[in-house]
């Protein structure tokens, strides 16, 4: 039985030509995690596996950093960046966990962080 | 410019244990993980598992898990892929493969070491 | 474990000839994809990784495409040079996979 959750930084918004941290947290489960993909729709930005680092996407490759921790941080943001962003935790022995960014950029300078949510 | 080059042929009995060696150069080695690839007489490529060799951090296939075991020597620039519990059908050409900078594609290959497993 | 399904596993064609091999992956690998060619008594050499991207000194008759579970591998005008045979990997997730493997031969 799956008894994680995984937090994340939830609805986040950003300005065009800045940067943002995209985070998530499995809690609840003793699960070892393997691995974590970080995908944006139908595309894969990032592969962070436990034991063997990082894969970085070639078309991400110049504007996706690694880190903080099994998080990424997305560069140089476009309101293109604008959209839905998962977190899938591999575990073992659970299986998977997803959690879901949103994040908006914004023409503007007004842009504040969103509160964190919880998905089951 | 980058080479592995991996240990002699090995002819073991079934049982026993074998180790092969794979030694790079012409990069820093602790930059990217080493895989273990295997391929038996007329079959596909078969992911043995990985090791990190900046920490250690190893992957092995479940189906390997317990029975292979992937060491570094970072001194020598060198990764260590042991196989115990030998049987007939470990019989393969072993690779040692480096992953690209940041990428999880195989690079850079070994010449591939012959392990026959025969009584 | 990811199961990647390659075919034809084996194919003859002509000198000039446009060739397609086709990989299947068993679930969403997204573009996490690499083909390789094998001669034969030698390693695999590195031709096409995350899906559509040309290796360092690859010759621009090697191209692939696709995404999620379907890929396409492609020699526009066969050499002779390119008998071999060719294999696909996925490393969406491990276990690491690769497809059984299409072998080249020329007509």
């Known amino acids: 039985m799956m008894t994680g959750t995984i937090e994340t930084t939830g609805n986040i918004s950003a300005e065009k030509g800045g940067s943002i941290i995209l985070q998530c947290h499995l809690s609840s489960t003793t699960a070892q995690v393997t691995q974590v993909n970080w995908e944006q729709q139908d595309q894969l930005l990032a592969i962070c596996n436990a034991d063997l680092g990082w894969h970085i996407s070639p078309s991400f490759k110049d504007r996706v950093a690694p880190g903080p921790g099994l998080g990424l941080t997305l560069q140089s943001l476009t309101v293109n960046d604008t959209g839905e962003y998962f977190c899938i935790y591999h575990t073992y022995p659970d299986g998977t966990y997803t959690g879901r960014i949103f994040l908006e950029v914004l023409e503007s300078s007004v842009a504040e962080h969103g509160a964190r949510f919880q998905i089951p | 410019q980058v080479q592995l080059v991996q240990s002699g042929a090995e002819v073991k009995k079934p049982g026993a244990s074998v180790k092969v060696s794979c030694k790079a150069s012409?990069?820093?080695?602790?930059?990217?993980?080493m895989h273990w690839v295997r391929q038996a007489p007329g079959q596909r490529l078969e992911w043995i598992g990985g090791i990190n060799p900046n920490q250690g951090g190893t992957s092995y296939s479940q189906k390997f898990q317990g029975r292979a075991t992937l060491t570094v020597d970072t001194s020598a620039s060198t990764a260590y892929m042991e196989l115990s519990s030998l049987r007939s059908e470990d019989t393969a050409v072993y690779y040692c493969t480096r992953s690209s900078y940041y990428r999880y594609d195989l690079d850079y290959w070994g010449q591939g070491t012959t392990v026959t497993v025969s009584s | 474990d990811i199961q990647m399904t390659q075919s034809p596993s084996s194919l003859s064609a002509s000198v000039g000839d446009r060739v397609t091999i086709t990989c299947q992956a068993s679930q969403d690998i997204k573009t996490a994809l690499a083909w390789y060619q094998q001669k034969p008594g030698k390693a695999p050499k590195l031709l096409i990784y995350?899906?559509?991207y040309r290796y360092t000194g690859v010759p621009s008759r090697f191209s692939g495409s696709g995404s999620g579970t379907d890929f396409t591998f492609t020699i526009s005008s066969l050499q002779p040079e390119d008998i071999a045979t060719y294999y696909c990997?996925?490393?969406?997730?491990?276990?690491?996979?690769f497809g059984g493997g299409t072998k080249l031969e020329i007509k």
């Open positions: 990997h996925q490393h969406y997730t491990t276990p690491w996979t």
């Open positions: 995350s899906a559509s």
């Open positions: 012409g990069y820093t080695f602790t930059e990217n993980a």
